[in-house]
């Protein structure tokens, strides 16, 4: 039978001779050289050689356990004379014995990690891991211990796990954001002579809201014209916050002051500024200075830092309103005046009033816009605003006069305003009634008495309050012995009636009737109009057949016998 123990071979042999492994031996071996030992399997004849006479095995090369920890070979013992095996072919193992020839290697050359600033001591940051290729089952060659070479007193590492934790209280990102920590992994349980490897851990402190907003100055002053419409931005204020991102977001609000209702503050999300805007119309004449208390606050607050104080700050904003010179303001948007058409020149119609709304109350002068009164019918007292006539009026020519009055500040002619004046001319009975048309009528020679031969109508340019009331009559000089009569219908019309039976056209072919038309107004106005009556030959139906044309060439006036 075979006689051997398990073979062990130390790795990384550095001697000049071959490294002795062990001896294959059969109890059949007499020592007379009759047996021949043969080696086969892993590395046989190359890595491992055998003395075929003695069975001594040697390693020809330096071996690395980490490359191959075990070699499996087969041994044979053969009788040289017969060539027959004296022992059954048997498998044996050469185990490579570990030495500490490998340092620990970290899984990453550089680790990156983050941890919130102001974290409690012992807060987990990251775990680093190093591996050692040496044999973990034999000795301490692969027993790794972690330690911190750089990064104290800020961070610590657990020696067995490689867990990095915070080691310092109140680490403040605003003071320092980046840390480079160097961790060593050492084998042999960290003992002297152990091999080591290092890695770098780049740790960034992430922001927490541990800083309130702060105004760089306690007071701000802005000025704005009183004419600024609501929504006008008048100034920007900015509080600074040492935090970043969401933690540095700021909301602005007006918390106090006389300007609480007059101004707004809006937050510019891009610049984190507070924009003070006009909320209501300002009036320099009412208030010239406003004081606001503006607050800047963090909308995202971490309760655990509230002990640091309120996460807000206040500043005083003083807003000064600038005077804008405003034009005079008339007491009315428009004026309606009236005057009788018989008014004498220089008659006062009424007056306008305008006042400078500015606190200075600059005096105002008045004038008529001559483009609206080309004929210079009206004038105005530049001092008191009295409107008066400068020409005679005629309602029948123009009933309404639309003119514009200008008020101008004496100290500042650029400041002026205008107002429309509507002047109504009131009627006076200054026109006589007259015929509505030229009347030329005809009478048949065989006409009967009291026949209506013409209806008369009158017109009057005047416009009496109670309407027209005209009366018609024959002129006194024609009233007696007239061949015709006038019948006043009392409805502003009159009829011409025949007064006799029959007319002779050869005796009198044309009659001229003077008719007096009067109105009923005060003072009474009347006029005389002439009606021409021609005598015509008519058939038995009363249709005119012929009329003399003499009437066309008769002189104006009364014909005899009318």
């Amino acid at each position: 039978s075979w006689m051997w123990n398990q073979f062990f071979l130390l790795e990384e042999y550095t001697g000049s001779d071959y490294q002795y492994v062990g001896k294959l031996h059969s109890d059949q071996d007499r020592g007379d050289g009759s047996l021949k030992y043969i080696l086969s399997g892993d590395g046989a004849g190359d890595l491992f050689i055998i003395n075929e006479n003695t069975g001594d095995i040697q390693a020809t090369k330096r071996l690395d356990r980490e490359e191959k920890p075990v070699y499996i070979l087969r041994a044979q013992a053969i009788n040289r004379r017969t060539g027959r095996p004296v022992e059954p072919e048997s498998e044996f193992i050469i185990k490579i014995h570990d030495i500490n020839d490998n340092e620990p290697i970290f899984t990453k050359e550089v680790y990156t990690a983050t941890v919130p600033e102001m974290s409690d001591v012992g807060t987990f940051v990251v775990q680093v891991t190093a591996t050692d290729a040496d044999d973990p089952t034999y000795g301490n060659s692969a027993k790794v211990v972690y330690s911190i070479l750089q990064g104290q007193p800020y961070f610590s590492v657990e020696s067995e796990t490689g867990i990095i934790k915070t080691a310092l209280l109140n680490m403040d990102r605003e003071n320092r954001e980046q840390y480079q920590v160097v961790i060593q992994a050492k084998d042999m349980g960290g003992q002297m002579g152990g091999l080591s490897g290092t890695t770098t851990v780049n740790i960034t402190l992430t922001d927490v809201n541990d800083n309130p907003p702060r105004f760089p100055q306690s007071t701000y002053q802005f000025k704005t014209p009183e004419s600024s419409p609501p929504g006008t931005p008048i100034g920007r204020i900015k509080a600074s916050d040492a935090d970043v991102g969401e933690n540095a977001e700021i909301e602005y609000s007006i918390t106090d002051g006389e300007g609480l209702d007059m101004f707004d503050v809006i937050t510019d999300q891009e610049t984190q500024e507070g924009i003070i805007t006009v909320k209501k119309l300002l009036d320099f004449e009412k208030k010239k200075v406003y004081t606001l208390k503006v607050e800047a606050s963090n909308p995202h607050v971490e309760p655990r830092f509230l002990y640091l104080g309120p996460f807000k700050d206040s500043a005083t904003v003083r807003i000064v309103v600038e005077d804008v010179d405003e034009p005079p303001v008339f007491s009315k948007l428009a004026y309606i005046l009236q005057i009788r058409e018989d008014a004498q020149i220089n008659t006062t119609i009424g007056s306008v009033t305008a006042q400078d709304p500015d606190a200075a109350r600059n005096p105002v002068k008045y004038s008529v816009d001559r483009h609206t009164d080309m004929d210079r019918i009206f004038n105005i007292d530049s001092g008191n605003g009295s409107i008066f006539t400068s020409k005679l009026l005629d309602r029948e020519t123009l009933l309404w006069h639309n003119i514009t009055v200008i008020a101008t500040e004496i100290n500042n002619p650029k400041q002026s305003s205008r107002v429309p004046l509507y002047i109504k001319v009131l009627d006076v009975n200054d026109n006589a009634p007259e015929f509505a048309e030229f009347y030329e009528t005809f009478v048949c020679e065989k006409a009967k008495a009291d026949q209506l031969i013409q209806t008369l109508r009158a017109v009057d340019k005047d416009d009496p309050y109670s309407g027209h009331q005209f009366s018609f009559s024959l002129a006194p000089e024609a009233a007696s012995g007239s061949n015709f009569t006038i019948q006043d219908n009392k409805d502003n019309t009159a009829g011409i009636l025949t007064r006799k039976n029959g007319y002779n056209r050869h005796e009198m072919s044309t009659y001229l009737l003077p008719v007096v038309i009067s109105d009923n107004d005060y003072p009474v106005q009347s006029s005389t109009g002439t009606v021409t009556v021609r005598v015509c030959a008519c058939d038995h139906h009363g249709n005119m057949q012929s009329c003399h044309a003499e009437a066309l060439i008769h002189p104006t006036g009364l014909s005899t016998g009318a």
Epitope: P216, Q217, S218, T219, Y220, Q221, K223, F284, E285, K287, K288, V289, T316, R318, V320, V321, E322, D323, V324, D325, D358, A359, A360, R361, N411
Partner: antibody
Amino acid sequence: EVQLVQSGAEVKKPGASVKVSCKASGYTFTRNFMHWVRQAPGQGLEWMGWIYPGDGETEYNQKFQGRVTITADRSTSTAYMELSSLRSEDTAVYFCARGVYGGFAGGYFDFWGQGTLVTVSS
Amino acid sequence: DIQMTQSPSSLSASVGDRVTITCKASQNIYKNLAWYQQKLGEGPKLLIYDANTLQTGVPSRFSGSGSGTDFTLTISSLQPEDFATYYCQQYYSGWAFGQGTKVEIK
């Protein structure tokens, strides 16, 4: 030429009141802010308040609030500063000064009165 | 409230000297600063406004500079009539004066 002429020196007892006048000429009185500034003996200048003669609006330094009253008479173009409940530390020269900006309650002072010495002594 | 600190509080100089007076504001007042000269028994006289603008009629030897919180009044060549007390004044928010700098003959 702008001129601010102030009333003469006054001697007052503690607890009394004093009224200093400042007559303006050479500009439109109603269009500029009129400020009052005082200067205690050997001391610096201290702003007291302003009035806008156009409409009589005023603003006072908090330190003097309740004790100082500034008024203006437009008909005579005169501004007045009245200080009540006088104490010895109110002994000072009181100046009126025109605010440079018409229609703006800010700015510097371009013309000053010659000053009125008010002495408070028992 | 904004405080104004003037320095020096007094200085001695000779005719022809270059004189510099400084004024510091407790917060940013931009260019809202005026300089005044006051002689004994008189009211102050405006020299400079808006930090560096010379008031009409004031000699060009007076100049002002600065912005924000730090300001300077310079008299390039001191004249006999320049011996007086100088005040700075902020008008950014309300009105406040420095405590004054007395310029005396050396």
